[in-house]
């Protein structure tokens, strides 16, 4: 009876997500058979989040809209470990929008989810950011410095990375 009601709850939760994500990949969290964490297929998972590399080339605003339609945001990178995970799935000859922008061109960078911008946890390429006209951030590969961030014009189409919280059922 308990298992039945738990299954019904899970099914209704899954239906909620079905409009955006017809398929979920779930793993058992810990030893408790009742706790499952899921990411949409084919998103990847790291810690408590799911990530999707969008290969369509769009402006920063359209990229953010595209993520939000899927219940996500452009990626907010909080740690070096998170960035190290993300770059495993990126192509070296491409650039990807992050959820980081400077809307007023005053060098006041802000994350899309309002996470406070912390200068000490940023991974800008050396000499970046460096242009008041370039108000959106990308992550890209430079042979001298590996992966890092760069400021670019927001209207220039790029690939992007979406991030959402894991779905717990």
């Amino acid at each position: 009876n308990f298992m039945y009601s738990k299954t019904v709850k899970r099914l209704s939760k899954l239906r909620e997500y079905q409009q955006y994500h017809p398929s979920l990949t779930c793993v058992m969290e810990g030893k408790d058979i009742e706790d499952w964490s899921c990411c949409p297929t084919p998103w990847t998972s790291f810690q408590s989040s799911c990530y999707f590399i969008s290969t369509g080339m769009q402006s920063w605003t359209k990229s953010q809209k595209n993520c939000s339609v899927m219940g996500a945001d452009l990626v907010v990178i909080n740690t070096r470990e998170e960035q190290d995970f993300i770059i495993q799935n990126l192509k070296r000859n491409s650039s990807y929008f992050l959820g980081l922008s400077d809307p007023g061109g005053r060098r006041h960078w802000q994350w899309v989810d309002q996470t406070p911008y912390n200068e000490n946890v940023t991974f800008w390429h050396s000499g970046e950011p460096n242009n008041l006209d370039e108000r959106c951030a990308i992550i890209n590969f430079r042979s001298s410095e590996e992966w890092g961030w760069n400021d670019i014009h927001c209207h220039v189409p790029q690939k992007s990375i979406c991030k959402m919280k894991k779905i717990y059922i």
């Epitope: 242009n131 008041l132 370039e134």
Partner: antibody, heavy 118, light 107 residues
Framework: QVQLQQSGAELVGPGVSVKISCKGS????????MHWVKQSHAKSLEWIGV????????NYNQKFKGKATMTVDKSSSTAYMELASLTSEDSAIYFC???????????WGQGTLVTVSA | DLQMTQTPSSLSASLGDRVTISCRAS??????LSWYQEKPDGTFKLLIY???RLHSGVPSRFSGSGSGTDYSLTVRNLEQEDIGTYFC?????????FGGGTKLEIR
């Protein structure tokens, strides 16, 4: 080649306003913000502010808020700066300069001399 | 505002000399330092940006160096066309600020 052509010298009385212009050519005007710089004997060079033709927004040095107003006309690739309530302190050469990466002024106008005199 | 202190305020040198102008910032400016030349006719020209990068068309006689708060511009093999006033400018923190200028004359 990139050129910034500024309007001619102005001789004006105290208390009035003056509007000077800076026409950009040889590049895509909306891709680069325009800065304004004041050169006076007393204070050497001072950054007045910057305007983005693409976004339409401005950023002023606090010192020049209320004194300078920057605008652009995209159709003519021209940036303008209006100086209000002029006093002798405003007598100076005013330059426009194109924004570039590494926070540099890559190209400068030839300057517009503004003289405030009764 | 971030202060830029430029020294000397003027200097006189002979053709072929090597001259150095210094600029000190009131705080670390992360190499976001540019140098400009004001010609005797009042026109401005960018020489060096990001501490040591030569702007296009600028002769290699000009070089820049420095880090943190201390920066310098060096002109080797001084030529007649180098006369004018030189200014440093920081681009680390708004409002951007300039040094007071160094007037270079030929002896």
């Amino acid at each position: 080649q990139v050129q910034l052509q500024q309007s001619g010298a102005e001789l004006v009385g105290p208390g009035v306003s003056v509007k000077i212009s800076c026409k950009g050519s040889g590049y895509t005007f909306t891709d680069y913000s325009m800065h304004w710089v004041k050169q006076s004997h007393a204070k050497s060079l001072e950054w007045i502010g910057v305007i983005s033709p693409y976004y339409g927004d401005t950023n002023y040095n606090q010192k020049f808020k209320g004194k300078a107003t920057m605008t652009v006309d995209k159709s003519s690739s021209t940036a303008y700066m209006e100086l209000a309530s002029l006093t002798s302190e405003d007598s100076a050469i005013y330059f426009c300069a194109r924004n570039d990466d590494y926070y540099r002024f890559a190209y400068w106008g030839q300057g517009t001399l503004v003289t405030v005199s009764a | 505002d971030l202060q830029m202190t430029q020294t000397p305020s003027s200097l006189s040198a002979s053709l072929g000399d090597r001259v150095t102008i210094s600029c000190r910032a009131s705080q670390d400016i992360n190499n976001y330092l540019s140098w400009y030349q004001e010609k005797p006719d009042g026109t401005f020209k960018l020489l060096i940006y990001y501490t040591s990068r030569l702007h296009s068309g600028v002769p290699s006689r000009f070089s820049g160096s420095g880090s943190g708060t201390d920066y310098s511009l060096t002109v080797r093999n001084l030529e007649q066309e180098d006369i004018g006033t030189y200014f440093c400018q920081q681009g680390k923190t708004l409002p951007w600020t300039f040094g007071g200028g160094t007037k270079l004359e030929i002896r």
